[in-house]
Structures are given as structure tokens and as C-alpha cells.
């Protein structure tokens, strides 16, 4: 990989962990004990973003998998997906905008705003075992705050 990256896991503000749900979807649920090993480990890469931006642009890949979170329009709605990439070419210093998230830290919590769709955030539902998605509201029912746990490489 040609860019700095670190391995981490993410939990939402309700302490739900993120796990794979099928080959191209993440879901959020509470895990305990040995089940914690199911949670997805991300490789967070530090990439170039907008010059004037005061947010930290990152790409979120799944560790040792050629899958990245990306934001695309589906049925005219910004949508979060896991996209398969060529591992020989990713991550790279100038990631396509759909792969870039602005990491925003507020009161020790993290938000991940889509660079492609400003004011749309990686979100989880209050309910258990539901897909991780791209949400267009903050401070409502859906959860947009996360904490990051570091995993040694």
C-alpha cells in the first residue's frame, strides 16, 4: 500500500460492533466475549481530500480483503456499499471520491461523512442486527457517532 494506514475496529455510540452480513454488506449488533472476533477490522488509509477542507479524509477498507466502503447513487439516493477493487491498485493516494470519508471528531466521538455526498454519514439503526447504511440526518433516531479501537498490525 502506498499510503499510511492503520488497523482499527469501529463501534457505534450504543457499543454495537460491525460485522459482515453476506459478501457485500455490514450490519451492527452487540457482541460479547469470543463473538467479538466476528467484528470487521478496517484498514483506515489517510488519503488526499479537498484542499480547503478542515476534515480528515480517509478510505475504509476491510483488512486483507479487496473491499472498500463506497458511496454511490442508487435509485437517486446516496447509498453505502462494499465495493470490490483490484488489490494491486488500492489503496492509493488519490482515491476516487466515492471511497473517501471525512473523519470528523467531536467530543471524542467520530463521524464519517461521505466526501461524495456532503451531510450524508455512515449510520447504524437503533435496532439490532440491521445493515450499516448512509444516512442523511444527524441527531435523529439513527446513529452517526462511532468510537475507534486500534488493532496492532
Amino acid at each position: 500500500a502506498p499510503v499510511r494506514s492503520l488497523n482499527c475496529t469501529l463501534r457505534d455510540s450504543q457499543q454495537k460492533s460491525l460485522v459482515m452480513s453476506g459478501p457485500y454488506e455490514l450490519k451492527a449488533l452487540h457482541l460479547q466475549g469470543q463473538d467479538m472476533e466476528q467484528q470487521v477490522v478496517f484498514s483506515m488509509s489517510f488519503v488526499q481530500g479537498e484542499e480547503s477542507n478542515d476534515k480528515i479524509p480517509v478510505a475504509l477498507g476491510l483488512k486483507e480483503k479487496n473491499l472498500y466502503l463506497s458511496c454511490v447513487l442508487k435509485d437517486d439516493k446516496p447509498t453505502l456499499q462494499l465495493e470490490s477493487v483490484d488489490p494491486k491498485n488500492y489503496p492509493k493516494k488519490k482515491m476516487e471520491k466515492r471511497f473517501v470519508f471525512n473523519k470528523i471528531e467531536i467530543n471524542n466521538k467520530l463521524e464519517f461523512e461521505s466526501a461524495q455526498f456532503p451531510n450524508w454519514y455512515i449510520s447504524t439503526s437503533q435496532a439490532e442486527n440491521m445493515p450499516v447504511f448512509l444516512g442523511g440526518t444527524k441527531g435523529g433516531q439513527d446513529i452517526t457517532d462511532f468510537t475507534m479501537q486500534f488493532v496492532s498490525s
Epitope: 500500500a1 499510511r4 488519503v47 496492532s152
Partner: antibody, heavy 127, light 106 residues
Framework: EVQLVESGGGLVKPGRSLRLSCTGS????????LNWFRQAPGMGLEWVGF??????????EYAASVKGRFTISRDDSKSIAYLQMNSLKTEDTAVYYC???????????????????WGQGTTVTVS | SYELTQPPSVSVSPGQTASITCSGD??????ACWYQQKPGQSPVLVIY???KRPSGIPERFSGSNSGNTATLTISGTQAMDEADYYC?????????FGGGTKLTVL
């Protein structure tokens, strides 16, 4: 003034240990990753390892040539980073530098992917 | 492991343009930096993120990076620019340096 100052170098016998310090001033020390480098006499620059800032867990990475022998740590309350060198070899003889690195790209002004402040170096001789 | 290759030496007359190259496999996909080091001194960052110049570095220093080659260009070279120049890139979380180029201003 933003600066880094290395200390702790000296003459040491092969197989022994030495701890170098890198003290920062004039900036928020904990916000930066810190690298250690070395330069053998008349030779080029060689990266030794780095430690991430507190926002990224203070985790470390090392060059293959020192992995298992050298350990980097930091005490942000004192604005000091350390390089603990064990099982020293004659080939570890060099001037050792620390520098700071912005490990993320927040804007065009933060020197992301560049090491903008270097210390003056401290000499380690293993003989 | 990843390697960066620089010419050992480059000579230039005062006022002329000096170009120092750095080659590595798909280097253009990585961020390249350049450091200047004068005898007995610590390195100084002169170019970062391929093309950007830190504050305090003269405009005569510029950088480019594409394909397998990064280039440091010094236009209107001055005697004070005589130094060793090192290219540097990241290979994953490892920092890699070129062997250095001694720039002589004739």
C-alpha cells in the same frame, strides 16, 4: 520556536543497550506521529521506525533491520519520545534523528506526507 | 522490499536548472518527498506530497511525480543549493529513502 532535540547518544559496547530521547517544544506534541531515523558515517538516511499520535493509539511500526531489538515509546505529558535500543551491533553506529510527521491530510497547510521538523541528531557509536 | 534509485551526483552551473530524479516501481502512485541535507546538518523538507513546497522554501524548488519517476527541479540554481538531496516515499507504513544525490554547483 518549533523544535525537536535528541539526547542520550554515546559510546556503547556490542550487545548492550541505550535509550535515546527526543524532546519537542513549541507545538502540541501528542498531535504528531514521530519517526526515528539514522545515518551511518558518510551514508544515506535510513528509517528506523515511528510511533503514531494519541489520536491513533500511539501504535508503532519498525524497519525490518531493528524489529525485535528497538522499541519506540512516547510520554506526551513530557513531550518526549524514546528509542530503546537493545542488543546493539556495530552496524547500529550512526547519527540518530527524530522528526515529526503529520499522519493525516487535514488541509493543504499541514505537511501531510512530509516530515517538516527534524532534530539536530545524537551520535551512537557501538564499538 | 521497496527501493528508490537516485543518481549519485548531479552537476549544474550557477543560474542553470538542476533536475534530480528518483525512480521506483509505480512511484507515481505514492507520495514523494524531497529533503536537502548540507554537511553536518539535519535534513530539511523541500518538497512534500509530490509538488508542495513548505513555507520558507524558495520558489525555485519544484517537484513532480508520475509513472515510475519523481523529479526535483531547482531552477536558477544558487551556490547555497549545493547539498545532498534525498527522495523519500511511503510503502505501506514503511518509510523508504533513495540513496541520495550530491548536487554540485560548479
Amino acid at each position: 520556536e518549533v523544535q525537536l532535540v535528541e539526547s542520550g547518544g554515546g559510546l556503547v559496547k556490542p550487545g548492550r543497550s541505550l535509550r535515546l530521547s527526543c524532546t519537542g517544544s513549541g507545538f502540541t506534541f501528542g498531535d504528531y506521529a514521530l519517526n526515528w531515523f539514522r545515518q551511518a558515517p558518510g551514508m544515506g538516511l535510513e528509517w528506523v521506525g515511528f510511533i503514531r499520535g494519541k489520536a491513533y493509539g500511539g501504535t508503532t511500526e519498525y524497519a525490518a533491520s531493528v524489529k525485535g531489538r528497538f522499541t519506540i515509546s512516547r510520554d506526551d505529558s513530557k513531550s518526549i519520545a524514546y528509542l530503546q535500543m537493545n542488543s546493539l551491533k556495530t552496524e547500529d553506529t550512526a547519527v540518530y534523528y527524530c522528526n515529526r510527521e503529520v499522519e493525516y491530510c487535514r488541509s493543504s497547510e499541514n505537511y501531510c506526507y512530509g516530515m517538516d521538523v527534524w532534530g539536530q541528531g545524537t551520535t551512537v557509536t557501538v564499538s | 522490499s521497496y527501493e528508490l534509485t537516485q543518481p549519485p551526483s548531479v552537476s549544474v552551473s550557477p543560474g542553470q536548472t538542476a533536475s534530480i530524479t528518483c525512480s521506483g516501481d509505480k512511484l507515481g502512485d505514492k507520495f514523494a518527498c524531497w529533503y536537502q541535507q548540507k554537511p553536518g546538518q539535519s535534513p530539511v523538507l523541500v518538497i512534500y506530497q509530490d509538488t508542495k513546497r513548505p513555507s520558507g522554501i524558495p520558489e525555485r524548488f519544484s517537484g513532480s511525480n508520475s509513472g515510475n519517476t519523481a523529479t526535483l527541479t531547482i531552477s536558477g540554481t544558487q551556490a547555497m543549493d549545493e547539498a545532498d538531496y534525498y527522495c523519500q516515499a511511503w510503502d505501506s507504513n514503511t518509510v523508504v529513502f533513495g540513496g541520495g544525490t550530491k548536487l554540485t554547483v560548479l
